[in-house]
Amino acid sequence: TPWSLARPQGSCSLEGVEIKGGSFRLLQEGQALEYVCPSGFYPYPVQTRTCRSTGSWSTLKTQDQKTVRKAECRAIHCPRPHDFENGEYWPRSPYYNVSDEISFHCYDGYTLRGSANRTCQVNGRWSGQTAICDNGAGYCSNPGIPIGTRKVGSQYRLEDSVTYHCSRGLTLRGSQRRTCQEGGSWSGTEPSCQDSFMYDTPQEVAEAFLSSLTETIEGVDAEDGHGPGEQQKRKIVLDPSGSMNIYLVLDGSDSIGASNFTGAKKCLVNLIEKVASYGVKPRYGLVTYATYPKIWVKVSEADSSNADWVTKQLNEINYEDHKLKSGTNTKKALQAVYSMMSWPDDVPPEGWNRTRHVIILMTDGLHNMGGDPITVIDEIRDLLYIGKDRKNPREDYLDVYVFGVGPLVNQVNINALASKKDNEQHVFKVKDMENLEDVFYQMIDESQSLSLCGMVWEHRKGTDYHKQPWQAKISVIRPSKGHESCMGAVVSEYFVLTAAHCFTVDDKEHSIKVSVGGEKRDLEIEVVLFHPNYNINGKKEAGIPEFYDYDVALIKLKNKLKYGQTIRPICLPCTEGTTRALRLPPTTTCQQQKEELLPAQDIKALFVSEEEKKLTRKEVYIKNGDKKGSCERDAQYAPGYDKVKDISEVVTPRFLCTGGVSPYADPNTCRGDSGGPLIVHKRSRFIQVGVISWGVVDVCKNQKRQKQVPAHARDFHINLFQVLPWLKEKLQDEDLGFL
C-alpha cells in the first residue's frame, strides 16, 4: 500500500488493513478508508471502512453478515437475469465475467424492445437497454425486468402497479413501484440494483443527465397542458411568459476537500456554459453548504440570469468559507433553496406556475446532521403544487438531480432525493471528482451540440484537435515544384475556409490535400471557390508584384464531414450561431455583432500555428483603434512594397492588422499558417474574424520561429466582415443562418 503503517490522524492503526491485490487510501483525515482495486476488480467484502471510537476499524462483513479476516480484490461480475418474461436468454450462467455477452429472444407473438445483445462491462453493468418481450396487448407496454432486479406484477392495465426488489446487499436505484398511467406511460423511472462498488462512467452520466436536462431546457414546439401520463418525450415550451430557475447546490463540508470543491466548481461553470449554449437564459441560485448553507446568488437578483456574472460569482467562492463549521447539513441547504422559491407574504406572483425549477445537488454523500432532507423536497413539491392534481400533476416543473461523488455516497439517500421520471435518470454516482469533471466536459460536447460552432473540449485529456477542432491542414502538391502548406478552418459540414493565394489556377483538385481532426487520411475535394475579386497580379502594372486583396477561398468537400470532438466548425460573423455563441438577443444585427467582435480598439485575438508537429495558440492584438494607422503603414517594409507611394494601395479596407510590440509583443504568423483563422475568443466560444493572408517579415526562416523580430513585423488578415456577401452566397445551403 502507498501508506506508511504509522498511526493516522484518527485513532485507528493501519496494521493489517491491507487488501490483497489492491491498495487503500485514507478519507476524512483518517476516520475512514477506501479500498482501491485495479480496473475489472472490486473490493471484497466492503469498499469502505470506518474508524470506530474504540480505536478499531469496522469489521469486514459480507452481505450475509459473515466476518472475513482479510479484504481482497475480486473480479467484477455482472448480475444474472433473475427472470426474463415471454422469452429466453442465452447462455445461462450463475454469473458473468467482464466482456461476457448474453442474447435475448422472444417467444412467438412477442416483440423484442431494448437490446437483443448485451455485454458485461468493466463497471459490473450490462451494456445497452433492458430487453423486453412484449405482445403490445397491455394498456401500458411491459416495463421490463432490468437485469438483477425482481419484478412483482404482470398486469399492465391502467392503474395497475408493478414493484421491484433487489437481492440482499444491493441497493435499488430508481423507482421501487411503478404505476401504469393514462396515455400508456409508467410512473417513476426504471429501477436498477447497485452494488457499492458500482459507479456510473462519465460517458453514461453525461448522456443520461444531458438527455434529461435537454428535455427540460430545449425550447421544442409542443402542446402545453400535458396530461398526467402523457408519454411524449418531456418537451417543454419556454414561452416568453414562462421561465426557469436553476439552483446549484454544492457540498463544501470537510469530507469534500479543497481540490474536489474546486473540481465541482469547474463542473458547474461548464454546466452554466452548456445551458447558455441552448440560448436559454435561466435565473440561477447558488448555494454552498456544510453545517450551514451560504447563498451566493439569489434567483431574485437582477444579474442572476447573466451567465457570465453567475460564473464569476461561482469562481470567487472559496472552500475555506465553510472551514469552521464543516458538518454536512443537506436539509438546511435545501431549505435555503426553498426560501428562494417561496414568495413574500405567501402571495404567489403572476406567472409563478409557469416557472420550472431545476435543483442540481453535488455531494460526497452522507448528511450527518439536520435531519432527513427528503422532507424539504416534499415541502418544495407542495409549494409548487406538484403531484396534487391528478389531471395536472405538474411534474415537469421540478427536476432534482443528485450527483454523488466518491465511495462514501449513501445510495439510498441520494436516490430518495432525486426526481424519478420515465426514461430519465436524475441520480448519479461517480467514482471521484476527476470523473465528474469528465462528465461535464463530455456533456458540453454531446452530439446535439456538435453542430454548435466555436465549441472546444478544453480538457486535460484533450488533444490538439480537441482544443482546435476547426483547424484544417492543407497542402498542394505541385509536380517538380515541391508543395505548398496552408491552414484553413472548418466552417460547415462541406466547407473549409482558407486563403486564395494557397492555390494557383493550375492546381487540380486531386493535388490538393485537406485533413481535419488530426486524421491521417485526406479529404476528397469537389472544388475550390475563389473570391471573384481576388487577383494576385491585379496591380503588377502599378509596380505591386503581389496584391492580396480579397485573399479568401472556400474548399468544397465531396463528402459531408462527420462532426465529433475533434472536428467541428468555427463560428462565422453575422450568423445565428454566432449570435447564440455570444449570448446576444436573437434580434441582434450584423452591425451589432461587428461592434461586439471588432470594436475600435486593440482587440485580443489568436491564431493557431503548428510548431514541431503540435498546434499552439498564439495570442495577438488586432490594431483596430489608434494603432491601426501605424500598423498598416508598416506594410511598406514588406518585400516588393518599398516603392508603394500610398500604402492603401496594398492595405485595402479588407485587411485587419496584427503584430508589432504594442500593446504587447505579438507573435507573428509563418508561411504555413496562411489561410488559417484569426479568431476572437469570447464567452468560451471561438469566432473567426479573419483569414491569415500575408506578413511583412518572414520570421520563420529555417523552419524556426525567430525570437527577436523587428517592431515593424506585422501580419495582415482578410476581415470576414468585408467579404460577407460572398460567404453568404457560397454557403447559402449550409444552414448557418446568415443575418
Partner: antibody, heavy 120, light 113 residues
Framework: QVQLVQSGAEVKKPGASVKVSCKAS????????MTWVRQAPGQGLEWMGW????????KYAQKFQGRVTMTRDTSISTAYMELSRLRSDDTAVYYC?????????????WGQGTLVTVSS | DIVMTQSPDSLAVSLGERATINCKSS????????????LAWYQQKPGQPPKLLIY???TRESGVPDRFSGSGSGTDFTLTISSLQAEDVAVYYC?????????FGQGTKLEIK
C-alpha cells in the same frame, strides 16, 4: 363462453336510486375489470367508470362522482352499479362491459343492457 | 376532457362500395415512445350493445371481417369498410382511452343507398 347478464328494466322517480346488477359467467370474474357505460335514448355512449373485482377498487368519471357506487360480490360473480339522486336525464340504457385480461380499455364483451327510466 | 368528433353524422353508401368514417380528437392519442394510438372503433346495431371492431387504431378484433380497417395517427383517424354489406348497417363510434374520462364520438349512422 363469456356471458354478462344484466338485471331487468327499472322505472324510478326523480331523487330515488337504482341498482343494476351484472352477472358474469364463462371466465374468472376477479381477473377482469368490469366497466359501466350508459346510452341515453337516441344518444351516444358515455363511460361511467370501472371496478376491479379482485380488489374492489373503483374509478369513476368525474361527472358521476358522488352519485355512483360500483360494488361486486365475488361469491356470485356479480358486479353492481348504483346511481343515486336520479334525474330525468339519467334515463338511459346502462351496460356492463368487460375488457381483456391485459387491457381493460377495449370492451370486448357487453351485457344486454338495462333500461332505467326516470319519470315523475 | 378529450372531445371526439365524428364526420359525417350519417352516411349512405351503395352495397359493395367503400364507406369511410372519420374521427378527430381534440388532442393527440399517440404515445410517441410506443407508437401506439389509444383509439378504438365500435359498431352498434339497433337494439344491441356495441361490438368492438378495431383497437390500437388499426388492430382488427378477432372475428371481425377484413373489409373493416382502421387507420390514422395522432388526432385524425378513419374507419373504412372496403365493400359495404347489408349487415354493416349500424351506428359506428370511435372511442379514446388516452386520458380519463374515456370518451366516445357522437356516432355516425351508416345506411345503404
Amino acid at each position: 363462453q363469456v356471458q354478462l347478464v344484466q338485471s331487468g328494466a327499472e322505472v324510478k322517480k326523480p331523487g330515488a336510486s337504482v341498482k343494476v346488477s351484472c352477472k358474469a359467467s364463462g371466465y374468472s370474474f376477479t381477473d377482469y375489470y368490469m366497466t359501466w357505460v350508459r346510452q341515453a335514448p337516441g344518444q351516444g355512449l358515455e363511460w361511467m367508470g370501472w371496478i376491479n373485482p379482485n380488489s374492489g377498487g373503483t374509478k369513476y368519471a368525474q361527472k358521476f362522482q358522488g352519485r355512483v357506487t360500483m360494488t361486486r360480490d365475488t361469491s356470485i360473480s356479480t358486479a353492481y352499479m348504483e346511481l343515486s339522486r336520479l334525474r330525468s336525464d339519467d334515463t338511459a340504457v346502462y351496460y356492463c362491459a368487460r375488457g381483456y385480461y391485459a387491457n381493460s380499455a377495449w370492451f370486448a364483451y357487453w351485457g344486454q343492457g338495462t333500461l332505467v327510466t326516470v319519470s315523475s | 376532457d378529450i372531445v371526439m368528433t365524428q364526420s359525417p353524422d350519417s352516411l349512405a353508401v351503395s352495397l359493395g362500395e367503400r364507406a369511410t368514417i372519420n374521427c378527430k380528437s381534440s388532442q393527440s392519442l399517440l404515445n410517441s415512445r410506443t407508437s401506439k394510438n389509444y383509439l378504438a372503433w365500435y359498431q352498434q346495431k339497433p337494439g344491441q350493445p356495441p361490438k368492438l371492431l378495431i383497437y390500437w387504431a388499426s388492430t382488427r378484433e378477432s372475428g371481425v371481417p377484413d373489409r373493416f380497417s382502421g387507420s390514422g395517427s395522432g388526432t385524425d383517424f378513419t374507419l373504412t369498410i372496403s365493400s359495404l354489406q347489408a349487415e354493416d348497417v349500424a351506428v359506428y363510434y370511435c372511442k379514446q382511452v388516452y386520458n380519463l374520462p374515456w370518451t366516445f364520438g357522437q356516432g355516425t349512422k351508416l345506411e345503404i343507398k
